[in-house]
């Protein structure tokens, strides 16, 4: 009788030990995971995060769609609606260059760097060549008439515009439009002014920064958060808190991301900090990620979202700050009347797009999202979509703008910058992060369930045996 009872008690004890071990392994395992993650996401030589941070292992592509104007004469002569037809995608590989001038500062636990710019055309991922022609707004004419509202100077500009045979619209190749061309009108200005114009001029052989970000050594909750940009904590473009540089650069976030979080990040492309909110769980190549999206609230007018009051910098075009979905970034572009929006004026007020025909906003194609692996905080997939527009206003002194009867926010192009973790990297990530965490979870569950089952079964058997013996 003793052998059997001892055996049953031993089984129950082993079960209890396994269950306890499984139970202990949960917080201990989580601690181990946290410790490993905390060690590996720090931005310093030797960590996984640092290696991927210096030079992204993901191929990043920037697709462009150009808005080809179909009725330039009609617009110029009759102030008609601008009819546009988007043409694209024209695809470039971007952000393939490693960060430069990386300098660790142990005093304040930061790392500073420059992000070099480069773009390589990808013909196989494009609908045409860089030599394709487009009818677009004359960038120099629109900008100069805005920068110099002075009537006297506008007469001078008119002389130069006429002499150079420039007009309200121009025909440019893709390469010229994006990366720059010598403008014939500006070439006539008898002072040393930059005569090169382009939507992204200058780009190649330039760099964004200097960025100074926290490396996470003192506090992992600050890793990758921007401390300063170009040596400042503010941008000097906006009033009040709108001018602050908040969050990371969106390539990664501090680890252990919660669905309830509002993820803040700074984008130099749009000259402001913005935020993303959780939308859904997504499975990306076997890795569970959280999809965060830019909400329409971020583009709302101060009437709808009072937090946005400091992004309204002028009262006329914005119809006393009631327009929404466009951001005037002229202060950030040397006074050029550049307006940023989502593609096809998604989330924008009707008055913004009422002067443009041919737009079809669509949330799925035109919104921005980030797919973030919550444990590490790494952005494993993203789609950054934005549209670049230029304001053009009537001018009674400039002949080619004389017949306009209203202001136009003219869409020039929209872009979709995307990056997705490669299959090899995803496999490595699964084995090193997700796999290990899943395995640990599995071991915890097996130990706990086997232990509980063993303990319960052996205890029931023991009790049954004892009651038989007593009888």
């Amino acid at each position: 009788g003793c052998d059997r009872n001892c055996g049953l008690i031993t089984g129950a004890v082993i079960g209890a030990v396994l269950a306890v071990f499984g139970g202990i392994l949960m917080p201990v395992g989580d601690m181990l995971i946290q410790k490993t993650i905390k060690k590996e996401v720090v931005l310093e030589e030797g960590t996984i995060a640092f290696k991927n941070w210096v030079k992204t292992g993901t191929e990043i592509y920037r697709q462009f769609w150009i808005f080809d104007v179909q009725n330039p004469q009609e617009v110029m002569m009759n102030s008609s609606n601008i009819q546009v037809k988007q043409r694209g995608p024209y695809t470039y590989r971007v952000r393939f260059l490693a960060k430069e001038n990386i300098t660790q500062d142990p005093k304040d636990n930061t790392v500073s760097f420059l992000q070099p710019n480069g773009a390589i055309f990808e013909p196989s991922l494009s609908v045409g060549t860089e030599a394709d022609n487009f009818t677009v707004l004359n960038l120099a004419v629109a900008a100069a008439s805005h920068i110099y509202p002075n009537p006297f100077v506008q007469v001078v500009l008119n002389s130069l515009i006429n002499k150079s045979k420039s007009s309200m619209f121009q025909v440019r190749t893709l390469r010229e439009l994006l990366w720059g061309y010598t403008d014939p009108f500006l070439s006539l200005v008898p002072y040393p002014v930059s005569t090169r114009v382009g939507m992204f001029y200058p780009y190649n052989n330039t760099a964004d920064g200097v960025y100074k970000v926290f490396n996470g050594k003192d506090s992992i909750s600050k890793v990758a958060i921007i401390d300063t940009y170009k040596g400042k904590r503010n941008l000097s473009y906006w009033e009040s808190y709108c001018d602050m540089i908040n969050g990371t650069d969106a390539a990664s976030f501090p680890p252990f991301v919660e669905k309830s979080q509002v993820l803040q990040f700074f984008s130099s492309d749009i000259c402001r900090s913005i935020y993303a909110v959780f939308e859904s769980d997504v499975n990306l190549k076997g890795i569970p990620v959280y999809r965060f999206v830019l909400p329409s609230k971020a583009f709302a007018s101060p009437v709808q979202n009072p937090d946005n009051h400091c992004f309204c910098t002028e009262k006329i075009i914005s119809k006393n700050c009631t327009s929404y979905g466009v951001l005037d970034i002229s202060k950030c572009k040397e006074g050029k009347p550049v307006y940023i929006s989502l593609p096809h004026f998604l989330y924008a007020s009707p008055d913004v797009s009422e002067t443009i025909d041919g737009l079809n906003p669509n949330e799925e194609e035109h919104r921005t999202y980030l797919d973030i692996e919550p444990i590490t905080g790494f952005t494993l997939q993203f789609a950054k979509r934005l549209q670049v527009n230029l304001l053009v206003k009537p001018s009674n002194k400039i002949q080619v703008l004389k017949r306009l009867k209203r202001n136009y926010i003219v869409p020039i192009l929209w872009l979709n910058e995307t990056g997705t973790i490669g299959d090899e990297k995803a496999k490595m990530f699964r084995s090193q992060v997700t796999g290990k965490i899943n395995l640990l979870g599995l071991i915890e569950m097996i130990l706990l369930s086997v232990g509980v089952v063993m303990f319960v079964a052996f205890m029931i058997s023991y009790c049954a045996c004892r009651s038989k013996t007593i009888k």
Epitope: N150, F152, V153, V155, K163, L188, P190
Partner: antibody, heavy 117, light 107 residues
Framework: EVQLVESGGGLVQPGGSLRLSCAAS????????IHWVRQAPGKGLEWVAW????????YYADSVKGRFTISADTSKNTAYLQMNSLRAEDTAVYYC??????????WGQGTLVTVSS | DIQMTQSPSSLSASVGDRVTITCRAS??????VAWYQQKPGKAPKLLIS???SLYSGVPSRFSGSGSGTDFTLTISSLQPEDFATYYC?????????FGQGTKVEIK
Amino acid sequence: EVQLVESGGGLVQPGGSLRLSCAASGFTIDAFGIHWVRQAPGKGLEWVAWIAPYGGYTYYADSVKGRFTISADTSKNTAYLQMNSLRAEDTAVYYCARSFFGYFDYWGQGTLVTVSS
Amino acid sequence: DIQMTQSPSSLSASVGDRVTITCRASQDVSNWVAWYQQKPGKAPKLLISYATSLYSGVPSRFSGSGSGTDFTLTISSLQPEDFATYYCQQHSNAPLTFGQGTKVEIK
């Protein structure tokens, strides 16, 4: 070196005509545009006429409109002010000046026009 | 037309003095104001454009300020060669117009 030299001033009877010249060197008048500014004896400066860059536009003060004509000969890099139906109140030193954005960075030495019988 | 009203029309000052001349436009001219110095028998010389921008070669004791309708030319420490007549001019709209001048004389 940028230089502007006026000539053609002198004594003229009321109702008469005179043609002032402004020879430019060191820059092309076509690219800048040229202004004429006058100063009556002991008085302040008065803007008279302007020819915009590339001859795209001419503009006159109300006091001389219909009587004065500004022109330019780009081959000679010279601007002119043709003054007709002159009056006693047109007596002044006439300066030609270079301007692009509306302020005058270079001036000539001036030429005196006296309208008297 | 835009009227430019300068004050005072004349002032007496000593070498080393700080001198301020004001100019008021009859309507908003933003920052499109220039200042000139003229000595007897000579052509005017540009000192300042765009209300505040010192022209090359002009001594730093000269400075301009203002925007909209009210503008100021300041000479921080008057030198012997600064005794002259000073004019403001708006270059916002044609016809371009000058102030009536301020004569700075030796006290």
